[in-house]
């Protein structure tokens, strides 16, 4: 083994590199003291060291750390981030898409019903969008919304242009009717399906997206304790206590000592293993009716088809609802 | 037969938007993240070493400082921990992750677990016999995956989507993205952060 | 005729549970998110819980999350609010209310006259 | 979650007008959620005045109109009435779908 250089006789050098840290000389020691206080750079012989400048050493090798593992998941975070911005607002597009797509074929195909049909289509899609960024709205609760709303205006526009404005009363008899005679035939359960898969599967997708930023996050943001400080503190700066200015730290030696100190950030490796696996089975998986793109894109169509439907049955319907409201509508009449 | 809304279609039958065709879609954009994301599957076992290769380790040089003394690089003492008596290396593992750590694990489990469930057979989607009472509905066909509309008729099988990515106000590509790679080690400029720090080499 | 009746409210207990009922008529009640919304003597409108139409969604207040349970029977038009672990401070009128919406709240636009709860000992 | 902003109270004198504000956060009001208003006399129910931050039910005089603007709402009343004097409340909600409610203002019609 060779003999380690003798240290500086003065600690000048060391002085000079120590004041970059901490401006104001008065913790250096002149000349080499035994360092009997020292706590982590534990001397062989004479030291440049105090056990002041021992703690600023230490906070600042924790500092070092802290920004090593920022610098190092500079690029992972910055593509999470900015895939989970491109992507929230994509779907916003989509969703205002479709809501123009469904209130074009109302104006194109029902004038009659449009300024209502255009409160209910705008209510759902705020809807959607509420849901897709984490609110609790049950899917199917939204559907039978649109299709409870619609009804009654489809009904005294369309089927029986006859009834007066504002019929309370019969408006009321018909969106229980909606449901008890399945007027939209299973339109409105086609539609629960496919909305509530695509949505479910945008939704953690985004959920997925932000969770991964925050576990970067959290890692980025660790404070590393104070054995780590020590380790990293002993193989970053002890060298320099004995004068040793240009040394640099063995490489099995430093992954031993970041094994140490990473032992917990280690730990998070099998889950974002799995996160990453995940996620890309979840996004294999995102097609047909599990592709909300591909859904709500195609809904004015299925809403289409649902009010042709309800067209194809109006006499049988408007007779059965004739009996059925037939109090309300008297009322309405009088 | 009904009105579609108008400059949407180029044949009624098929949802064909009118918008320039771009490359990207938002399922094109998907797969290229996550093969990005691929690429970081390794982050955290990879991280010690990483940090290694981004400070000053001694590469080239003969003699190498191992937390105590000065000694050869190649030496078994390079590699041992020079500071046994001090405080145990394998006490320091044994106290387990930070309460932070253990609340974002369990985070990931939980989104773990939702992803599974969510990424199940997608082969039986729709119920094949979804027109039960009631009014007669009109059938879907077989592939009801594909059923966007309902009755004959109307129905659209829905093509290819809309390329919405060029709407958005901004271009977020990753490669532009400041320390692209993580596997590069540039020496040189990771002095720059022991520098502000004091740490010379 | 559009009516909302509550019933259930009284005397009780700190730390004792209470049922409040609201029973819906002359509207389709499995329709309609349904709210319940309560008023302290002398102080203003303090919303406590919602349930969307179908019951697969609800709501709470920061104030009674964990204490109050709401539920709906839409067979019976019946709402329900499930009072435990009762407080001083939940001494209020509690109103029953309907929304204009079925999924979630908005505007509610039929109000019960309301029941009174008083919590002491 | 945190009650929207209103005064305490306002006044005017018969045909005049008054106006209320609301304001909440950008989580709520300011989020795309809309506001409504109700009135309430002393021992009654709350009545709803406005939905949708300007929309009037059936039987609501035109002389009560709503705007929202930003994090903030106003409910107008104009040619004030003896029988306007009420407490009037706002209301909304936040992106968790819960209610806020605004503190009240008591509209007094002097003379």
């Known amino acids: 083994q060779p003999p380690p250089p003798p240290p500086d006789a003065t600690c000048h050098q060391v002085r000079s590199f120590f004041q970059r840290l901490q401006p104001g000389l008065k913790w250096v020691p002149e000349t080499p003291v035994p360092g009997s206080d020292l706590q982590v750079c534990l001397p062989k012989g004479p030291t440049c060291c105090s056990r002041k400048m021992e703690e600023k050493y230490q906070l600042t090798a924790r500092l070092n750390m802290e920004q090593l593992l920022q610098s190092a998941s500079m690029e992972l975070k910055f593509l999470i981030i900015q895939n989970a911005a491109v992507f929230q607002e994509a779907f916003e597009i989509v969703v205002r898409h479709a809501k123009n797509y469904t209130n074009a074929m109302f104006k194109n195909n029902y004038p009659s019903l449009t300024p209502q049909a255009f409160e209910f289509v705008g209510e759902f899609f705020t809807d959607v969008s509420l849901y897709i960024l984490g609110s609790d709205i049950n899917v199917d609760d939204m559907v039978n919304e649109l299709f409870d709303s619609l009804f009654p205006v489809i009904y005294t526009q369309l089927m029986n242009p006859g009834l007066p404005d504002s019929a309370l009363d019969i408006n009321e008899c018909l969106r229980g009717a909606r449901r008890d005679l399945k007027v939209f035939g299973n339109f409105p359960k086609l539609i629960m399906t496919q909305v509530s898969k695509s949505l479910q599967v945008t939704r953690i997708f985004l959920q997925a997206l932000n969770l991964g930023i925050e576990v970067i996050n959290t890692t980025d943001h660790l404070k590393f304790s104070k054995d780590c400080g020590r380790m990293l503190t002993r193989m970053w700066y002890c060298s320099y206590c004995q004068g040793l200015m240009m040394v640099k730290p063995c490489g099995g030696y430093c992954n031993v000592v970041m094994q140490g100190c990473m032992a917990g950030v280690v730990e998070i490796d099998k889950y974002w293993r799995e996160y990453i696996l995940s996620l890309e089975e979840l996004v294999n998986g995102m097609y047909r009716i599990y592709d909300m793109e591909n859904v709500l894109l195609g809904l004015f169509s299925t809403i289409h088809d649902s009010i042709q439907y309800v067209q194809k049955n109006a006499g049988k319907l408007t007779t059965t609802i004739g009996k059925l409201c037939a109090h309300s509508q008297q009322r309405q009449y009088r | 037969s009904a009105y579609y809304p108008e400059d949407l279609f180029i044949d009624k039958k098929v949802l064909k938007v009118a918008h320039v065709e771009h490359e990207e879609t938002l399922s094109s954009r998907r797969r290229e993240l996550i093969q990005k994301l691929k690429s970081f599957i390794s982050f955290y076992s990879a991280l010690p070493g990483y940090i290694c290769s981004h400070s000053p380790v001694a590469e080239n040089d003969t003699l190498c400082w191992n937390g105590q003394e000065l000694v050869e690089r190649y030496s078994q003492k390079a590699a041992r921990n020079g500071m046994k008596n001090q405080f145990n290396l394998h006490e320091l593992k044994m106290k387990g992750p930070e309460p932070v750590v253990s609340q974002i694990i369990d985070k990931l489990k939980h989104i773990n677990q939702l992803l599974r469930t969510m990424s199940m057979p997608k082969g039986r989607v729709l119920d094949k016999n979804l027109d039960e009472e009631g009014f007669e509905s009109g059938d879907c066909g077989d592939d009801e995956d594909e059923c966007i509309g309902g009755s004959g008729d109307g129905m659209i099988k829905v093509k290819n989507q809309l390329r919405f990515l060029a709407e958005l106000a901004y271009d977020l590509d990753v490669d532009d993205a400041p320390g692209n790679s993580q596997q590069a080690t540039p020496k040189d400029n990771e002095i720059s952060t022991f520098h502000n720090l004091g740490n010379v080499h | 005729q559009v009516q909302l009746q509550e019933s259930g409210g009284g005397l009780v207990q700190p730390g004792r549970s209470l049922r409040l009922s609201c029973a819906a008529s002359?509207?389709?009640?499995?329709?309609?998110?349904m709210h319940w919304v309560r008023q302290a003597p002398g102080k203003g409108l303090e919303w406590v819980s919602a349930?969307?139409?179908?019951?697969?969604?609800?709501y709470y207040a920061d104030s009674v999350k964990g204490r109050f349970t709401i539920s709906r029977d839409n067979s019976k038009n019946t709402l329900y609010l499930q009072m435990n672990s009762l407080r001083a401070e939940d001494t209020a009128v509690y109103y029953c209310?309907?929304?204009?919406?079925?999924?979630?709240?908005?505007?509610?636009?039929?109000w019960g006259q309301g029941t009174l709860v008083t919590v002491s000992s | 979650q945190s009650a929207l902003t209103q005064p305490p109270s306002a006044s005017g004198s018969p045909g005049q007008s008054v106006t209320i504000s609301c304001t909440g956060t950008?989580?709520?009001?300011?989020?795309?959620?809309?506001v409504s208003w109700y009135q309430q006399y002393p021992g009654k129910a709350p009545k709803l005045l406005i939905y949708?931050?300007?929309l009037r039910p059936s039987g609501v005089p035109d002389r009560f109109s709503g705007s929202k603007s930003g994090t903030s709402a106003s409910l107008a009343i104009t040619g004030l009435q003896a029988e306007d004097g009420a407490d009037y409340y706002c209301q909304s909600y936040d992106s968790s779908l819960r209610v806020v409610f605004g503190g009240g203002t008591k509209v007094t019609v002097l003379g």
């Open positions: 002359g509207f389709t009640f499995s329709s309609y998110a």
């Open positions: 209310a309907k929304d204009r919406r079925g999924s979630h709240a908005d505007a509610f636009d039929v």
């Open positions: 349930i969307s139409s179908s019951g697969g969604s609800t």
């Open positions: 950008s989580s709520d009001v300011g989020h795309k959620f809309p």
């Open positions: 949708k931050n300007l």
